[in-house]
């Protein structure tokens, strides 16, 4: 089942080597798995990682570094992802998505 996330489309410009923080606003009662995707022009969306709310754990996709992508919940209503040490190849649209099973 797909769930709505109250995402706000934002444009962020950062210098190479800096960090960026993205917030995913969760709909009331969102549970299950919250996924982060990166969509770059001319490519299929790529899942980076997902957060398992049942076990409060993060599962990284292969080739994804825990030092590069840092996910944490600042409140029960949002999940944040910090992208560190930005390079040009990090450019793209980042999405969060959730479903219950």
């Amino acid at each position: 089942k797909s769930s709505n996330l109250e995402g706000r489309t934002k444009s962020v410009i950062r210098q190479t080597g800096s960090s960026a923080e993205i917030t995913c606003d969760l709909a009331e009662g969102s549970t299950g798995y919250i996924h982060w995707y990166l969509h770059q022009e001319g490519k299929a969306p790529q899942r980076l990682l997902y957060y398992d709310s049942y076990t409060s754990s993060v599962v990284l996709e292969s080739g994804i570094s825990p030092g590069k992508y840092d996910t944490y919940g600042s409140t029960r209503k949002n999940l944040r992802m910090i992208l560190r040490n930005l390079i040009e190849n990090d450019s793209g649209v980042y999405y969060c998505a959730t479903w219950d099973g």
Partner: antibody, heavy 120, light 107 residues
């Protein structure tokens, strides 16, 4: 320069607990994921656990999951490893290491290590 | 979990020799491979990251090749300070795993 100094090791009985610390200096601690890697006497290296820079995400080897807890205090530039229900096979030198912030991960540098001995 | 297999487990060589250590992953890890050097009683030290990038300060006599599942670390013109144990490590997927190590001893 980057410096990592572990402490808290020692002799503990099976089933006991120990808390390791790693004091970091010379870099912006909260920006980096940090890891613990161990080495049993005369053996190879085994990754134990990693915590993200914010402390919000943790990862564990199956061999320690449910028994060890990694954490950090970014205000004190300190990494911790709480080890409970210790077993003889946990006997090792425990190293803390700084992770990269690149797309691919690596450990650099490493602390000198602290020896944990689990024996009755 | 991804298994990392190093060979040989040990080797004897002389100063000036060319030494080759191989590391094989149980599945494709692209270029997500690192190499460490460890001397007795010391902490490991990063030599090479991302399969082919030499860490700052590492001499050019260390070279690497390979991608996917098979990787090679070569030390040309072996120096006294190179006698140590070398470990490969994959950073493609958690749990991060290391090879069992290759000890380079003086002949």
């Amino acid at each position: 320069q980057v410096q990592l100094v572990e402490s808290g090791g020692g002799l503990v009985q099976p089933g006991g607990s120990l808390r390791l610390s790693c004091a970091a200096s010379g870099f912006t601690f909260s920006t980096y994921a940090m890891s613990w890697v161990r080495q049993a006497p005369g053996k190879g290296l085994e990754w134990v656990s990693t915590v993200s820079g914010s402390g919000g995400t943790t990862y564990y080897a199956d061999s320690v999951k449910g028994r060890f807890t990694i954490s950090r205090d970014n205000s004190k530039n300190t990494l911790y490893l709480q080890m409970n229900s210790l077993r003889a096979e946990d006997t090792a030198v425990y190293y803390c290491a700084k992770d990269s912030t690149a797309v691919t991960d690596w450990f650099d540098p490493w602390g000198r290590g602290t020896l944990v001995t689990v024996s009755s | 979990d991804i298994q990392m297999t190093q060979s040989p487990s040990s080797l004897s060589a002389s100063v000036g020799d060319r030494v080759t250590i191989t590391c094989q992953a149980s599945q494709d890890i692209s270029n997500y491979l690192n190499w460490y050097q460890q001397k007795p009683g010391k902490a490991p030290k990063l030599l090479i990251y991302a399969a082919s990038s030499l860490q700052s300060g590492v001499p050019s006599r260390f070279s690497v090749s390979g991608s996917g599942t098979d990787f090679t670390l070569t030390i040309s013109n072996l120096q006294p300070e190179d006698f140590a144990t070398y470990y490969c490590q994959q950073s493609y997927s958690i749990p991060w795993t290391f090879g069992q190590g290759t000890k380079v001893e003086i002949k």
